[in-house]
């Protein structure tokens, strides 16, 4: 293991951390159990504890960004560096930022949590096996309503466990419908939309109306982020997979790799490729936020870099489902802060 | 021991082009970040380029559009293609190499320089 | 963008005095801030960083001080190679930028 220079720590053991902004790539729940989970593995094994707080005077303050962000280290876009953070002190110092422009995940995929269906909102797992068919993102497959859903084990066929996946014909968010499924067609501004728009938007929030109507009624919401079928790269990032669409006069209800020759899964944007060529790559395993947290608090606690591989400090990221801190790990914090003490013995107490 | 050693400078007129490389030698060139940082004659630093690991760039407004930082890990080398140039840009061009890499930040400033190479534009 | 602005711009005293160099950031930078020495002809050469560190081989009479928008450069005893220019470089925002530099000269 390695410290920063001069040893810097935090001189007090209670510290407290902000989240400041989320990111879109998961439900904030699931951000907020990473986080914390993150600081877990460094409580467990020294006298430190974290104390979420909503205040920008915390220690460690957690923010999302992208390129330049408000500090003398501008991200660079996906992959390459994915995270950064800065020694502990005051200020800025022990703050802990996350490059947006990475897919955040929990390293196995989008987290797409499921509502309704026989699951109990566990989130969906991908790929999984329908009708002998591999599935990579929430499909509408085997069902006449139009709703997206998908399974929340590997193999629908055997498991028959699934849920409905967040789509504007289940329900919108905020908004000033209560959460009611979008209407389509709907009319805005004399127009007929028939999918959801940024129409009358500048922050570029999809939204629809949940009447046929909005210039008469003005009810809207806000349509789900759809991570699983968001593209990236080719020429039309951030725009949604289109189910089923058609490449080479061939029908696809999930994306697929055909016509590459690197194995990378891909979708049209609109239903058919072969006649608007708009497409893009969809989304892949993402990086563990949990993992990529857990290596920024480590600096943010005083860690420098590892040159042990298989520890958590090592300054390249692996996923792995395993205990993520090495005993380097542990033996570089303990270093910093010593070890957690052990409870206080108890008397024996006699009936 | 650590060298940075630049070298295709020289005159060139106003609208001109020239390629500036800058070989490097002595540490893990592929894991650091890379700067080229001027000096007009008699004046003070001005930095115009960084590269990351990554390949990912920025610029100095005074040169964005017409400059290009590139680096080839394989040969351990950083150039900085300048096009359009103009009688502004006269200065002696030094390549840097950040003292630390990756994800912990501090500012911890440009550990070493080449020597510089002279670009004069005039006509 | 903040501007850095070095103080005195000539610095006139005689080998074994003190100097003080002044930088003075025009917004909080916390500690992002390196101090290069540059004689004519050559290359700048890193000589504090992260504001109070020593860059390896400086001799220990160079010193840094300082957070947030001011920051001293502190020669204790001066040498005779110590006459040179002194530049600061901030790092706190992007973009990064330098100085306008210090003359140190002798007297």
């Known amino acids: 293991f390695q410290t920063f220079e001069g040893d810097l720590k935090w001189h007090h053991h209670n510290i407290t951390y902000w989240i400041q902004n989320y990111s879109e790539d998961l439900p904030r729940a699931v951000i907020d159990d990473a986080f914390a989970r993150a600081f877990a593995l460094w409580s467990a094994v020294t006298p430190l504890t974290f104390t979420r707080v909503y205040s920008r005077d915390a220690d460690i303050v957690i923010q999302f960004g992208v390129a330049e962000h408000g500090d003398g280290y501008p991200f660079d876009g996906k992959d390459g560096l994915l995270a950064h953070a800065f020694p502990p002190g005051p200020g800025i110092q022990g703050d802990a930022h996350f490059d947006d422009d990475e897919l955040w995940s929990l390293g196995k995929g989008v987290v797409v949590p499921t509502r309704f269906g026989n699951a109990d909102g566990a989130a969906c797992h991908f790929p999984f096996i329908f009708e002998g068919r591999s599935y990579s993102a929430c499909t509408t497959d085997g069902r006449s309503d139009g709703l997206p859903w998908c399974s929340t084990t590997a193999n629908y066929d055997t498991d028959d466990r699934f849920g409905f996946c967040p789509s504007e014909r289940l329900y919108t968010q905020d908004g000033n419908a209560d959460g009611k499924p979008c209407q389509f067609p709907f009319i805005f501004q004399g127009q007929s939309y028939s999918a959801c728009t940024t129409d009358g938007r500048s922050d570029g929030y999809r939204w629809c109306a949940t009447t046929a109507n909005y210039d008469r009624d003005k009810l809207f919401g806000f349509c789900p982020t759809r991570a699983d079928s968001t593209v990236m790269g080719g020429n039309s990032a951030g725009e949604l997979c289109v189910f089923p669409f058609t490449f080479l006069g061939k029908e696809y209800s999930t994306c697929t790799s055909e016509g590459r020759g690197d194995g990378r899964l891909w979708c049209a944007t609109t239903s058919n490729f072969d006649s608007d060529k708009k497409w893009g790559f969809c989304p892949d395993q993402g990086y563990s936020l949990f993992l990529v947290a857990a290596h920024e608090f480590g600096h943010a606690l005083g860690l420098d870099h590892s040159s042990v591989p298989e520890a958590l400090m090592y300054p390249m990221y692996r996923f792995t489902e395993g205990p993520p801190l090495h005993k380097d790990d542990v033996n570089g914090i303990r270093h910093l802060y010593g070890p957690r003490p052990e409870p206080e013995p108890r008397p024996p107490t006699t009936t | 021991e650590v060298q940075l050693l630049e070298s295709g400078g020289g005159l060139v007129q106003p609208g001109g082009s020239l390629r500036l490389s800058c070989a490097a030698s002595g540490f893990t060139f592929s894991q650091y970040d890379m700067w080229w940082v001027r000096q007009a004659p008699g004046k003070g630093l001005e930095w115009v380029s960084v590269i990351y690991p990554s390949g990912t760039t920025f610029y100095a407004d005074s040169v964005k559009g017409r400059f290009t930082i590139s680096r080839d890990n394989s040969k351990n080398t950083l150039y900085l293609q300048m096009n359009s140039l103009r009688a502004e840009d006269t200065a002696v061009y030094y390549c840097?190499?950040?003292?630390?890499?990756?994800?912990?930040?501090?500012?911890?400033?440009?550990?070493?320089w080449g020597q510089g190479t002279l670009v004069t534009v005039s006509s | 963008e903040i501007v850095l602005t070095q103080s005195p711009a000539t610095l006139s005293l005689s080998p074994g005095e003190r100097a003080t160099l002044s930088c003075r950031a025009s917004?909080?930078?916390?500690?992002?801030l390196a101090w290069y020495q540059q004689k004519p002809g050559q290359a700048p050469r890193l000589l504090i960083y992260d504001a109070s560190y020593r860059a390896t081989g400086i001799p220990a009479r160079f010193s840094g001080s300082g957070s947030g928008t001011d920051f001293t450069l502190t020669i204790s005893s001066l040498e005779p190679e110590d006459f040179a220019v002194y530049y600061c470089?901030?790092?706190?925002?992007?973009?990064?930028?330098f100085g306008q530099g210090t003359r140190l000269e002798i007297k």
């Open positions: 470089q901030q790092r706190g925002n992007w973009p990064i930028t």
């Open positions: 917004q909080s930078i916390s500690s992002f």
């Open positions: 840097a190499k950040d003292r630390a890499y990756g994800d912990y930040v501090g500012w911890n400033g440009f550990d070493y």
